[in-house]
């Protein structure tokens, strides 16, 4: 056969679907690789052909579209499973061709099993909710196109294994789940099960996502430097080790680059000709607020080092702060020579 533009295996689309549920998979050619859509291609006389390679096999084979109840079908640029089976796992290829043109792309499809509590190897999207922020909603994802708008599905929401009914601050509202006031206790996995009829059969779509409650932007503040501060003076003798911690609190902020750094005499520590090391530790609160500690250490400090300016800087999307450490040379205690005068005796 004539040459075909082969876009290879598109690993960007690691498609995972649940066993025994409907799945609709669009041919990625029209979404990502070609400059025209399916309708244009079809009008121009191009045909879309599907085939697949089973898991752990090398042999490409045509997809059987003559299964009972049309279990696998194609509609325009969509491959339908009604429903999937475990052994549908494999690499699927869609090829667009006529006598003079050919283009194809493959993508992996994994059919995944779930248990009665919706646990599975499925990669779960994470949805972050702000703590105590007012009403926030999550929406049952990836259910468009499965049934016409005239069909009214039933939607059941679960938190973990439990159906959401009479929860204090979580209210199912069809495809949406509303959190009246999100709290730490709302962290967890939420599942919507969408049930709809089609041609006398009933199908279920299961969608799970992870909710993580994080600090609210209403409460976010610029970084707070707890140390160094005005109450602690780092008083050292030459030859001693100088250790100065910089401890900074950062409010949770979506996509913020939280940073802590030291300058010595206005320069970065690497540019100063002293043997300085900096070690950092990071801890997070339950709402993903962050505390960073950077310890600046000079093993054997010199009197010259004790005259330098050591400043800790911190920056987040909320602002920038800096604080100088109070460093000074320890003044040696005066050495008193006590003379015991014993020579005042009377003669």
């Amino acid at each position: 056969s004539e040459r075909c533009d082969d876009w290879g295996l598109d690993t960007m689309r690691q498609i995972q679907v649940f066993e025994d549920e409907p799945a609709r998979i669009k041919c990625p050619l029209f979404e990502h690789f070609l400059k025209f859509n399916y309708s244009t291609a079809h009008s121009a006389g191009l045909t879309l052909i599907w085939y697949w390679t089973r898991q752990d096999r090398d042999l490409e084979e045509p997809i059987n579209f003559r299964l009972p109840e049309n279990r696998i079908s194609k509609e325009k640029d969509v491959l339908w499973f009604r429903p999937t089976l475990l052994n549908d796992t494999g690499n699927y290829t869609c090829m667009l061709r006529n006598t003079t043109y050919c283009s194809k792309v493959a993508f992996p499809l994994e059919v995944v099993q779930k248990d009665s509590c919706f646990n599975s190897p499925m990669k779960l999207p994470v949805h972050k909710l702000y703590i105590e922020y007012g009403i926030q909603r999550i929406t049952c994802p990836n259910v468009d196109g499965y049934f016409p708008s005239s069909v009214k599905p039933t939607i059941t929401w679960y938190m973990g294994c439990y159906k959401i009914q009479n929860f204090n601050n979580v209210i199912p509202e069809g495809m949406n789940l509303s959190f009246l006031i999100a709290l730490i206790s709302n962290n967890g996995n939420y599942t919507c099960v969408v049930t709809y009829p089609e041609n006398g059969r009933t199908f279920h779509l299961t969608r799970t996502l992870t909710v993580k409650v994080v600090g609210s932007p209403k409460n976010a503040v610029p970084p707070v430097i707890h140390s160094p501060n005005d109450h602690v003076v780092y008083e050292k003798e030459p030859g001693e080790e100088l250790l100065i911690p910089c401890t900074v609190y950062f409010s949770f902020l979506m996509d913020s680059r939280n940073e802590v750094w030291w300058t010595i005499d206005g320069k970065k520590p690497d540019d100063i000709t002293i043997d300085v090391t900096i070690n950092e530790s990071i801890s997070h609160s339950r709402t993903e607020d962050e505390t960073r500690t950077q310890i600046l250490s000079i093993k054997k400090v010199t009197s010259e080092d004790l005259k330098r300016s050591y400043v800790c800087h911190a920056r987040s999307a909320k602002g920038e702060v800096a604080k100088a450490a109070k460093v000074k040379q320890k003044v040696p205690a005066p050495r008193y020579t006590v003379e015991l005068a014993c020579g005042f005796g009377a003669t």
Epitope: W261, K268, D270, I278, N279, I282, H313, E320
Partner: antibody, heavy 119, light 107 residues
Amino acid sequence: QVQLQESGPGLVKPLGTLSLTCAVSGGSISNSNWWSWVRQPPGKGLEWIGEIYHSGSTNYNPSLKSRVTIALDWSKNQFSLQLRSVTAADTAVYYCARYGSGPFGGDCWGQGTLVTVSS
Amino acid sequence: DIQLTQSPSFLSASVGDRVTISCRASQGISSYLAWYQQKPGKAPKLLIYAASTLQGGVPSRFSGSGSGTTFTLTISSLQPEDFATYYCQQLNTYPFTFGPGTKLEIK
């Protein structure tokens, strides 16, 4: 003295995945630095791809975010770049670099590796 | 994204000349600006960070100034090894962007 060295295939097929590794010697990737990737198409300027902090926190250029992953391998003292679904426009010299926090800039760079996207 | 514009794009000068290269940001970036030198086939080399602080090991003929949106790199007396392309980079806001470069050539 910290040194960075990129490695990976020089030729990647369209729609394939570009995978590069940056080995860090003379220092530890667990130090408080941002380990970054920057690229430069032939005859053009520099483009920041993204970065990873020693803690694992990442930031990516929005223009590439959907296709890129940067990861750390503490055991090998290296970090890596994966760029998926590549096209000819991704042909460039790829540099790994060490950036300090704040305004410190990229003070240590690998020598760069040319990656060509072609079938 | 923050756009950085450099001027001039090309600059011809002689050894011993004093040259200045300008970098302008489309919005304020405080002092979060770095300057790099790049020679053909080589990686960029950091010259200046925090807009005006000289990177360790860089000759003192290089200096930087500016804050906010307008920045300048100055080479006080050009040496033969200074002929290269110079880039500014902002480190204030994601994505970190580079200027288009200024190519410094021997007159």
